[in-house]
Interface confidence: medium
């Protein structure tokens, strides 16, 4: 994908609300372009915070003001509603509600939208077409919650409009505005180190790869041209500068480390793989 983000691309907003007791609550709202955070919500000023210079996409100030107002009202209403119905719905304090909603693009075309609500980390209800539906596994509590949410069809129409119209328009504008940033190619740096000893006479070899963008990367321990199937890849982790970090480890008998190498393939390297040899690696680690 030319935008440096894996297909399908999505834009989604996540609302995490923690209800500690009847009067004490907290919420976190964030906006994400796939796995890149682009927006956050400042609860004190009830404003959207733009985390990237291009986070406004092609929306006008007026449209942003409308969205801020909508989020402000909905946050207040959601808190009021959940607090009012908590007992009836058998929500036991402390509890957490997570809402994720957004839309997806596939090959430059809008391929769908989604809105899901989880209670205590488990799927609870979702928004389909123009109304809320319970997840079958969530039971009667979720059915009752849907009944409450579907009382106001006007609210559901607004939600439908946000998902089917506002979100797709926004993601297309966001991708266009952020093109230069999203299409950038940043070369990885790689280095080798010892990990904690897995046992007597064995070594853990660690290949660190950092500072790369976009996210897709291939890292493997090799013996000559032979990929070492014991290679353990960690999660690709974000760095503060918007690049990524990954480590790949391999456990071997001490005497078998000599002819091992770590190979890194990344789009920014244009076919010139990074190859680091363990035997050249300083024993201080």
């Amino acid at each position: 994908n030319a935008d440096g983000l894996k297909e399908p691309l999505s834009f989604h907003v996540t609302w995490i609300a923690s209800f500690y007791n009847h009067s004490w609550k907290q919420n976190l709202v964030s906006g994400w372009l796939s796995d890149l955070q682009t927006h956050t919500w400042d609860s004190n000023s009830s404003t959207i915070v733009f985390l990237c210079p291009w986070s406004r996409g092609n929306f006008s100030n007026e449209e942003w003001k409308e969205l801020e107002t909508l989020f402000r009202i909905r946050t207040i209403r959601s808190f009021e509603g959940i607090r009012r119905y908590a007992h009836e719905l058998q929500f036991e304090y402390p509890f957490e509600i997570q809402v994720t909603g957004g839309c997806e693009l596939h090959s430059g075309k809008v391929s769908g939208s989604f809105l899901q609500l989880a209670y205590q980390g488990s799927d609870f209800v979702s928004f389909q077409n123009n109304s809320w539906l319970p997840y079958p596994v969530a039971g009667n509590m979720a059915k009752h919650f849907c009944k409450v949410l579907n009382q106001n069809q006007h609210e559901n129409d607004i939600t439908h409009n946000l998902l089917s119209d506002t979100c797709p328009r926004f993601i297309l504008g966001l991708l266009d505005a952020g093109k230069a940033h999203l299409q950038r190619q940043v070369k990885p740096e790689a280095w080798l180190s010892h990990g904690p000893s897995p046992g007597p006479g064995h070594l853990q070899l660690v290949c660190h790869v950092s500072g790369f963008y976009p996210k897709p990367v291939w890292v493997m321990w090799m013996r000559g041209e032979q990929e070492q199937q014991g290679t353990q890849r960690g999660d690709i982790l974000p760095s503060a500068d918007g690049t990524w970090y990954l480590r790949a480890t391999l456990e071997v008998a001490a005497g078998e480390a000599a002819d091992l190498s770590c190979r890194v393939k990344h789009s920014s390297l244009e076919g010139q793989d990074i190859v680091l040899y363990w035997e050249h690696h300083s024993s201080v680690g």
Epitope: L70, I73, N130, H154, H160, T166, R169
Partner: antibody, heavy 118, light 107 residues
């Protein structure tokens, strides 16, 4: 600059029909719901009908349901109100209004007068 | 349908006065309340939306407050161009409904 210009009003006999148009400019027409709101002479404002940005959802006041039809042509940036079986109580200035995310009517046209009289 | 009741239906005031208009909804409408100004022969103009958000281009002497069922529009210092009729409107549910209007006249 947002502009909404209504046309199609006039004098019509009870039971007759009329089609109002509203030409929109200055904003992404297809992204916004649109409404018709009317005002009888010397009276207050009454919402008549609304349509979503895509045209997929329509809404009507009970007083006009079954008689009026709202539609839009996003390729022409135009909103329509087809009014059939008109009654004397439909006499009013009809305004088209842009919906700000269903929150409020943030821009209005200048209005077009519909008079139903024999 | 949700009924919107404005008070007073008319008031007389002088330039520089502080004017308050109230609007009551027949059921809770959260913050889904808007205020409009209309001058004779003209289209309504949005002043305040979502109970307290000032529409762009509207002077800061206009302010809105309230939530639930009771709302207030305040003009902190009445100007000559403010003599008009003011309407509240709920956008909480379909159909959206308006108050009957409050006419602000010169004393």
């Amino acid at each position: 600059e947002v502009q909404l210009v209504e046309s199609g009003g006039g004098l019509v006999q009870p039971g007759g029909s009329l089609r109002l148009s509203c030409a929109a400019s200055g904003f992404t027409f297809s992204s916004y719901a649109m409404s018709w709101v009317r005002q009888a002479p010397g009276k207050g404002l009454e919402w008549v009908s609304a349509i979503s940005g895509s045209g997929g959802s329509t809404y009507y006041a009970d007083s006009v349901k079954g008689r009026f039809t709202i539609s839009r042509d996003n390729s022409k940036n135009t909103l329509y109100l087809q009014m059939n079986s008109l009654r004397a109580e439909d006499t009013a200035v009809y305004y088209c209004a842009k919906d700000a995310l269903w929150l409020a009517f943030d821009y209005w046209g200048q209005g077009t007068l519909v008079t139903v009289s024999s | 349908d949700i009924q919107m009741t404005q008070s007073p239906s008319s008031l007389s005031a002088s330039v520089g006065d502080r004017v308050t208009i109230t609007c009551r909804a027949s059921q809770s409408i959260s913050s889904y309340l808007n205020w409009y100004q209309q001058k004779p022969g003209k289209a309504p103009k949005l002043l305040i939306y979502a109970a307290s958000s000032l529409q762009s281009g509207v002077p800061s002497r206009f302010s809105g407050s309230g939530s639930g069922t009771d709302f207030t529009l305040t003009i902190s210092s009445l100007q000559p161009e403010d003599f008009a009729t003011y309407y509240c409107q709920q956008s909480y549910s379909t159909p959206p409904t308006f108050g009957q209007g409050t006419k602000v006249e010169i004393k």
